[in-house]
């Protein structure tokens, strides 16, 4: 049966027995900032192309052993949610890999900001038809990587991020305090926001929306045909990538303020228990949760 | 994310530097009154000391980068300081990433065309 | 254009080995693994396993498990597969095709397996 | 015996529709996005027709779509033509591996 967070984003006219809007995405490509991928997993395989871009910290530690699956984990993971044949939102949408983030799942704002300058250069040199860059990452405010994500933006890309898994305000990290940038934080099946060990998502009004972000089944590179429940704002923001990529690939004009607004707009709201954010962060905190458009377009999101 | 905002820096820790215009006779002296800043991230862990981004002003162009880019590495290495460029901005933001002791960072905001400068810094896998 | 192109026809005593190759190009290689599918004289088709282009890793159908090795050399862009202790009900024309999703097959190489 | 349960022939006059089933479990057919449809012509390798249930790769006719309802997966060809006499195979996914149908001959009248 569908899994509950695609259950979740799905408007209740297609919740049948499963989850497939045919060919969703197909006009738009979504880059994805992240670990190494295995971009030949039964889930993705031709639906990932992984671009020559490295720019990686060594992983920390003599000692550290260089597995490839745990390599490729989270990057994996996000690639399956975005697109996956069964598990992902937009099935139709073809996706580049940057690989930013090393084994341990670490990255630096340098690292980052030339993976948006290639991005960029990219565009200039073939321009295609709309493009989502996912930034499934978060550090510090960074006042550098809000500008290259500003001028980005400005550029006519939709650039979606993880708030960030800090349970704290979104707006002390970057990209996630970037104004002009999608800033996502995680619900659970309950509608509660997402606690993860000790902490859980961030809050604030630097987050836009939240969408699912705890028990997310995607693609694991464990193997070729294996799949893997994840948690954190990272899967919550390629939810809403996911559904980005639909939306501009049935509306390819949208303009960023468009986009946000028919988000914010298809959104389910005030499903959110707010008692868990700080008492000075519930006004703040957008109670929001992603969705699908419902079936009134259906010719536009369904074809 | 949350477009209407203002600019909040948080915890950011903010260092501005006046320039001083009695620098090494600089060929292209800044505004007078002008100041770059210096920043780094507010959570000591996370920070990349060493690696620097310098943020050029927005119509900087690449050849003015590179050249400022030399010009550091020459003053540099007057000061008896080895400084390696390890990437120049061009296509979002002017600039260049570069690898260099903290100590340099006074004579580095003071070169033409800076609007800032950030050390580097950690990001995660969320 | 995408082609798959496989080694030529086999003529195997039972007890031996087979080793069928196949050569990959005009695509992305890490993008998809290799399929291999068999079709035995006037049958349906068989999926015998996969490998992937990107690292290597395996999966062998239960039957040929044990049986069957598929290695990759990246360097060539060529695809593999050994089959030992062949029987003759391994008579078949041997397919590579790209991916699970199989989208590009090789022209087949015909193997008979015969005392 | 295949896993997955096609009817053994099928035939139809040039200009009729007909439609080859296959059949399958919860386990595979029902339980993916993933099932194919491939043509196979006497002598040649099979050419994928049908993917993701209804998907047509470029340079397939419209005439060839496809469809499912709960464990079933259903190819249909509209406007037969002569050329389209051939085997028909449908696969899908399975948890860890991928199954054929036993395969349809079609027979053009």
């Known amino acids: 049966s569908i899994p509950w967070n695609l259950e979740r984003i799905t408007p209740p006219r297609y919740r049948a027995d499963e989850y497939q809007p045919p060919d969703g995405g197909s006009l738009v490509e979504v880059y994805l900032l992240d670990t190494s991928i295995q971009s030949d997993h039964r889930e993705i395989e031709g639906r990932v192309m992984v671009t020559d871009f490295e720019n990686v910290p060594e992983e920390d530690g003599t000692r550290f052993h260089r597995q490839a699956s745990k390599c490729d984990s989270h990057g994996t993971h996000l690639a399956g949610v975005v697109s996956g044949r069964d598990a992902g939102v937009a099935k139709g949408a073809s996706m580049r890999s940057l690989r930013v983030l090393n084994c341990q799942g670490k990255g630096t704002v340098s690292g980052t900001l030339i993976g948006l300058e290639f991005i960029r250069k990219s565009q200039l040199v073939q321009p295609v038809g709309p493009l989502v860059v996912l930034l499934p990452l978060a550090g510090g405010y960074s006042r550098v990587l809000n500008a290259a994500c500003q001028r980005l933006a400005r550029a006519g890309v939709v650039l979606v991020t993880a708030a960030g898994n800090f349970r704290d305000d979104a707006c002390l990290y970057s990209p996630a305090s970037a104004p002009e940038v999608i800033t996502v934080g995680a619900t659970n099946a309950q509608d509660q926001p997402v606690t993860l060990g000790t902490l859980g998502t961030n809050f604030g009004r630097c987050v836009d929306l939240f969408a699912p972000g705890e028990d997310i089944i995607g693609a694991s590179s464990d193997c070729s045909t294996c799949f893997v429940s994840q948690s954190g704002t990272s899967q919550a923001a390629a939810h809403v990538a996911g559904i980005a990529a639909m939306m501009l690939s049935a509306e390819p004009e949208l303009t960023l303020a468009e986009l946000r607004q028919r988000l914010i707009h298809f959104s389910a709201k005030d499903v959110i228990n707010e008692a868990w954010f700080p008492e000075d962060q519930r006004v703040l905190t957008p109670n929001l949760v992603a969705a699908l458009p419902p079936s009134t377009h259906e010719n536009l999101y369904f074809q | 994310g949350a477009m209407g905002q203002e600019d909040e820096d948080g915890d950011y820790e903010e260092l501005v530097l006046a320039l001083r215009s009695e620098e090494d006779g600089l060929a292209e002296a800044p505004e007078h009154g002008t100041t770059a800043t210096f920043h780094r991230c507010a959570k000591d862990p996370w920070r990349l000391p060493g690696t620097y981004v310098v943020v050029l002003k927005e119509e900087t162009h690449l050849s003015q980068s590179e050249r400022t880019a030399r010009r550091l590495q020459a003053q540099a290495a007057r000061r008896g300081y080895l400084t390696k460029i390890l990437h120049v901005f061009h296509g979002l933001l002017p600039g260049f990433l570069v690898k260099m002791s903290g100590d340099l960072l006074e004579l580095a905001l003071k070169l033409p065309h800076v609007d800032y400068i950030e050390e580097d810094s950690s990001v995660f896998a969320q | 254009q995408v082609q798959l192109v496989q080694s030529g026809a086999e003529v195997k005593k039972p007890g031996a080995s087979l080793k069928v190759s196949c050569k990959a190009s005009?695509?992305?290689?890490?993008?998809?693994?290799i399929s291999w599918v068999r079709q035995a004289p006037g049958q349906g088709l068989e999926w015998m396993g996969w490998?992937?282009?990107?690292?290597?890793?395996?999966n062998y159908a239960q039957k040929v498990q044990g049986r069957v090795t598929m290695t990759t050399d990246t360097s060539t862009s060529t695809v593999y597969m050994e089959v030992r202790s062949l029987r003759s009900d391994d008579t078949a024309v041997y397919y590579c095709?790209?991916?699970?999703?199989?989208?590009?097959w090789g022209q087949g190489t015909t193997v008979t397996v015969s005392s | 015996q295949s896993a997955l349960t096609q009817p053994a022939s099928v035939s139809g006059s040039p200009g009729q529709s007909i439609t080859i089933s296959c059949t399958g479990t919860?386990?595979?057919?029902?339980?993916?996005?993933?099932v194919s449809w491939y043509q196979q012509h006497p002598g040649k390798p099979p050419k994928l027709m049908i993917y993701e249930v209804s998907n047509r790769p470029s340079g397939v006719s419209n005439r060839f779509s496809g469809s499912k309802s709960g464990n079933t997966a259903s190819l249909t060809i509209s406007g037969l033509q002569a050329e389209d006499e051939a085997d028909y195979f449908c696969?899908?996914?399975?948890?860890?591996?991928?199954?054929f149908g036993g395969g349809t001959k079609l027979t053009v009248l």
């Open positions: 919860s386990s595979d057919v029902g339980g993916y996005n993933s």
């Open positions: 696969s899908s996914y399975t948890s860890t591996s991928m199954v």
């Open positions: 005009g695509y992305s290689l890490t993008s998809y693994g």
């Open positions: 095709a790209r991916g699970y999703g199989m989208d590009v």
């Open positions: 490998i992937s282009a990107y690292n290597g890793n395996t």
